[in-house]
């Protein structure tokens, strides 16, 4: 079994978390994918999901969360912009195949957002100054609601989903983007877990 680990990221209000979820296997390219938060004592909550089937290089925006799936490189880009203190929590990226249980793709992220905007990069060596742009054509996708033995998906919490952004392009200047390479669960673990399942739509790491 794969041990669930988490990595801690400390950011300030107003900054952007920019994550690359690595799914690698082609059979997952078109699968719907989701960004979830796990609050203490609660089941995971889906904050945003791609379309079904997931479209290539087609941004989906839910409030301050933007998802963009890059099929040709097996990467799902997740951005949480204009972070708020209430966004603090434990997050994960999953392959979302209801009614089956979502499959986590990488180490969970423990996000800690603190008060006080910093216009300069923090202590994280991966910090960069960036302008995050969201195309005007950003789509909003509906995430299916379903319950499985260990996962419950429901409407996103107010702290994340109810903060709306204009449909026009977002320009975030003087924002620290924390970029991290997400690790996928082991190849054999994921493959064996999925091999007996029929893919509802339409793949792993070493």
């Amino acid at each position: 079994a794969t041990k669930l680990t988490e990595e801690k990221y400390e950011l300030k209000e107003g900054q952007t978390l920019d994550v690359k979820c690595d799914y690698t296997l082609e059979k997952f390219a078109s699968s719907q994918k989701a960004w979830q938060i796990i609050r203490d004592g609660e089941m995971p909550k889906t904050l945003a999901c791609t379309e079904r089937p997931s479209k290539n290089s087609h941004p989906v925006q839910v409030g301050r969360i933007i998802l963009e799936d890059y099929h040709d490189h097996g990467l799902l880009r997740v951005a949480m912009v204009n972070l708020q203190v209430e966004d603090s929590g434990l997050y994960q990226c999953v392959i979302y195949q209801p009614p089956k249980e979502p499959h986590m793709l990488f180490d969970r992220i423990r996000l800690v957002v603190t008060k006080g905007f910093s216009g300069t990069p923090g202590s994280n060596e991966n910090s960069t100054q960036n302008v995050y742009k969201i195309p005007p054509t950003t789509t909003k996708a509906l995430c299916p609601l379903y319950t499985s033995p260990r996962t419950v998906t429901q409407a996103p919490p107010k702290s994340t989903a109810d903060v709306s952004t204009p449909d026009s392009e977002i320009n975030l200047t003087n924002v620290t983007d924390i970029i991290r390479e997400q690790k996928l669960i082991s190849e054999e673990d994921l493959e064996q877990k999925l091999i007996s399942e029929e893919d509802l739509h339409h793949h792993h790491h070493h």
Epitope: K20, D22, T24, L25, E26, K27, A29, S30, Y70, H71, D72, H73, G74, L75, R77, N126, I179, E181, E187, E191, I195, D199, H202, H203, H204, H205, H206
Partner: antibody
């Protein structure tokens, strides 16, 4: 244990054809793209091409040096990838390796031992 | 096509000393902050063996004296303390764009 075994190599005259096979075992063959890489004696490695999975409609990609002459195919039911080589030239003489990546545009973690193709009159 | 140029073509290093091989790409091999650049070792009569993937990740079972670094267009493979069994030809390879390409190889020998 992942194993890749190439076969079908041999001596062929210029302009002739040859079909190489790569028998795979130890993993779910249909899940991964398969590649062919060649190496002329005393020379470096040259990527020949790849074939993706059913999820990607078995799309194929080739190096410019073989495009239009070589065709990569696969039979998932037989766990086998193929390299059909037509209009062979002397410069195609090389050891041909079958290799498996670790996912979309990922590294080649598994290689076969190779099969020698000699194009000569 | 992306051209990978390795330097030097050949290298002689004393046992226990550091060996450094460079690989320069004609254009970036990065997508976002992922570098789709890998390193292989090949010994005579054998197929290549994966050492480093995505620029800096050590393949399972590979000794930790091997390390990789770089991003964009410039990459480095380092062997911190050369061992006799490290004598081989080393190749970099990019998979960011089709066609995939290899560097011309660097032959590493013992001085």
């Amino acid at each position: 244990e992942v194993q890749l075994v190439e076969s079908g190599g041999g001596l062929v005259q210029p302009g002739g054809s040859l079909k190489l096979s790569c028998a795979a075992s130890g993993f779910t063959f249909s899940t991964y793209a398969m590649h062919w890489v060649r190496q002329a004696s005393g020379k470096g490695l040259e990527w020949v091409g790849r074939i993706r999975t059913k999820s990607s409609n078995y799309a194929t990609y080739y190096a410019a040096s073989v495009k239009g002459r070589f065709t990569i195919s696969r039979d998932d039911s037989k766990n086998t990838a193929y390299l059909q080589m037509n209009s062979l030239k002397t410069e195609d003489t090389a050891v041909y390796y079958c290799t498996r990546d670790m996912g979309i545009r990922r590294q080649f973690a598994y290689w076969g031992q190779g099969t020698l193709v000699t194009v000569s009159s | 096509d992306i051209v990978l140029t390795q330097s030097p073509d050949s290298l002689a290093v004393s046992l226990g000393e550091r060996a450094t091989i460079n690989c320069r790409a004609s254009e970036s091999v990065d997508t976002f902050d992922y570098s789709f650049l890998h390193w292989y070792q090949q010994k005579p009569g054998q197929p290549p063996k994966l050492l480093i993937y995505r620029a800096s990740n050590l393949e399972s079972g590979v000794p930790d004296r091997f390390s990789g670094s770089g991003s964009g267009t410039d990459f480095t493979l380092t062997i911190s303390s050369l061992q006799a069994e490290d004598v081989a030809v080393y190749y970099c390879q990019q998979s960011n764009e089709d066609p995939y390409t290899f560097g011309q190889g660097t032959k590493l020998e013992i001085k």
